[in-house]
């Protein structure tokens, strides 16, 4: 008789999840020699231990603490780039501007980027059929709790000027319900962070509006100011040119506004 299995609303665990996490860990240590002390088998064991045999709607930040400890990493606190709804451009930027870091440029972020995972209460099985959806099922699921945990720690580590890339093509350029709006903004430390600088990325070729005047940006400014952190905002009218100018700053066309 087939065993009854909870059917969740979200997609199941990414195929080859254990192999992918382990391979990514080794790749990360190959790319970043300063992380060669990391034991990737232990990292996978700690990752697995955070959600295996646990109800996938009852995961806590505490469950991830062994993994957080193993993945401890020092990134330059004044070189942090946060992003919201514009991951690809943020990653293209840090690929060129090698001294800046998104969360996915750290070991733990790199391990989990674009993956889904969950287990089942009281069995050691990984659920490849379905996992809880944040809205339709529960917020304390393995994926959401992981990103909340690592995002909080990442924001807490930031200092001096923190940059955030925002998607100017969205109806809510700043969304209070995004990970940036609900976690990172509230965990920047006013005693360490002097300024949050928002880069609003324009989508349209002919879009010359000042999106820094958008009501949601004003809302972000208000939240940040109330936390005793200065706020500044820049329009990035031409993201393609912006990246090109980061690559080749001496290019003559890079003196004009981008």
């Amino acid at each position: 008789v087939p065993r009854w299995r909870q059917q969740w609303s979200g997609p199941g665990t990414t195929k080859r999840f254990p192999e992918t996490v382990l391979a990514r860990c080794v790749k990360y240590t190959e790319i970043h020699p300063e992380m060669r002390h990391v034991d990737c088998q232990s990292v996978w064991d700690a990752f697995k231990g955070a959600f295996i045999s646990k109800h996938p709607c009852n995961i806590t930040e505490e469950d991830y603490q062994p993994l957080m400890k193993l993945g401890t990493q020092t990134v330059p606190c004044n070189k942090i780039l946060l992003w919201s709804r514009i991951k690809d451009l943020a990653h293209q930027f840090t690929q060129v501007q090698r001294d800046m870091f998104t969360l996915e440029d750290t070991l733990l972020g790199y391990l989990a980027d674009d993956l889904t995972w969950c287990g089942e209460f009281n069995t050691s099985k990984i659920n490849y059929q379905s996992c809880p959806d944040w809205r339709k099922d529960c917020s304390n699921n393995p994926v959401s709790v992981f990103w909340k945990t690592v995002s909080r720690r990442f924001a807490e580590a930031a200092c001096d000027v923190v940059h955030v890339m925002l998607n100017g093509s969205r109806s809510k350029i700043f969304d209070k319900n995004s990970t940036f709006g609900s976690v990172e903004v509230h965990n920047l430390q006013p005693e360490k962070v002097q300024t949050l600088e928002a880069w609003v990325i324009h989508g349209g070729r002919e879009d010359s509006r000042d999106l820094c005047q958008d009501p949601t940006i004003k809302e972000l400014e208000s939240i940040i100011s109330k936390r005793n952190i200065q706020f500044s905002c820049k329009n990035i009218y031409r993201p393609d040119k912006f990246l090109q100018c980061v690559k080749n700053p001496e290019d003559s066309s890079c003196t004009s506004e981008i």
Epitope: R16, A23, K27, E30, I31, P33, Q95
Partner: antibody, heavy 120, light 107 residues
Framework: EVQLVQSGAEVKKPGATVKISCKVS????????MHWVQQAPGKGLEWMGW????????DYAEKFQGRVTITADTSTDTAYMELSSLRSEDTAVYYC?????????????WGQGTLVTVSS | DIQLTQSPSFLSASVGDRVTITCRAS??????LAWYQQKPGKAPKLLIY???SLADGVPSRFSGSGSGTEFTLTISSLQPEDFATYYC?????????FGQGTKLEIK
């Protein structure tokens, strides 16, 4: 069985661009970093750069920076190395190589090499 | 960049001899060193990784030792198929670098 199979020999004129392919089989392409190594005739080995095929992230040796582009096509499990503004000193055998994850970060697997001759 | 200096550059020896090749690093690379064998027209073959671990399928007459800045590759009893060029490589830091090579010839 892990295999890295490179494209055939090329003859190019100075100033031209060459693009060499490295098709892999026997493992999951995105699970490993791919490196490229140059060996000029009668000379030693020189590391050129790496790519993470999963994300397309790259890093290049300063000597080749600006002239080399490493790419990966995950739909065909193929890595590419493109070298532009060719000069006679670029005449060499080019290898793709990867580690085994169990052998430190030494290159346990190599392509057979591609000879590029730059001559006017 | 980390410089690796191999010595000697050329070495003549006979079948059955014990030979030692040295690789000196310009800074501490811990045990992050590999040794390769290369024959004419062929790709290099990994012999030793992590300074002293034997790669799969490599005969036990090959051994590596050392850490920090001084490393050696030893072939305990030369076989005819061992006449080739040997390279050390550091993977402690990017850019990865190789020694200039040691050509082992039949005396």
């Amino acid at each position: 069985e892990v295999q890295l199979v490179q494209s055939g020999a090329e003859v190019k004129k100075p100033g031209a661009t060459v693009k060499i392919s490295c098709k892999v089989s026997g493992y999951t392409f995105t699970d490993y970093i791919m490196h490229w190594v140059q060996q000029a005739p009668g000379k030693g080995l020189e590391w050129m750069g790496w790519i993470d095929p999963e994300y397309g992230r790259t890093d290049y040796a300063e000597k080749f920076q600006g002239r080399v582009t490493i790419t990966a096509d995950t739909s065909t499990d193929t890595a590419y190395m493109e070298l532009s503004s060719l000069r006679s000193e670029d005449t060499a055998v080019y290898y793709c190589a990867r580690s085994a994850h169990t052998t430190g970060f030494g290159f346990a697997y190599w392509g057979q090499g591609t000879l590029v001759t730059v001559s006017s | 960049d980390i410089q690796l200096t191999q010595s000697p550059s050329f070495l003549s020896a006979s079948v059955g001899d014990r030979v030692t090749i040295t690789c000196r690093a310009s800074e501490d690379i811990y045990s992050n060193l590999a040794w390769y064998q290369q024959k004419p027209g062929k790709a290099p073959k990994l012999l030793i990784y992590d300074a002293n671990s034997l790669a799969d399928g490599v005969p036990s007459r090959f051994s590596g030792s050392g850490s920090g800045t001084e490393f050696t590759l030893t072939i305990s009893s030369l076989q005819p198929e061992d006449f080739a060029t040997y390279y050390c490589q550091q993977y402690n830091n990017y850019p990865y670098t190789f020694g200039q090579g040691t050509k082992l010839e039949i005396k």
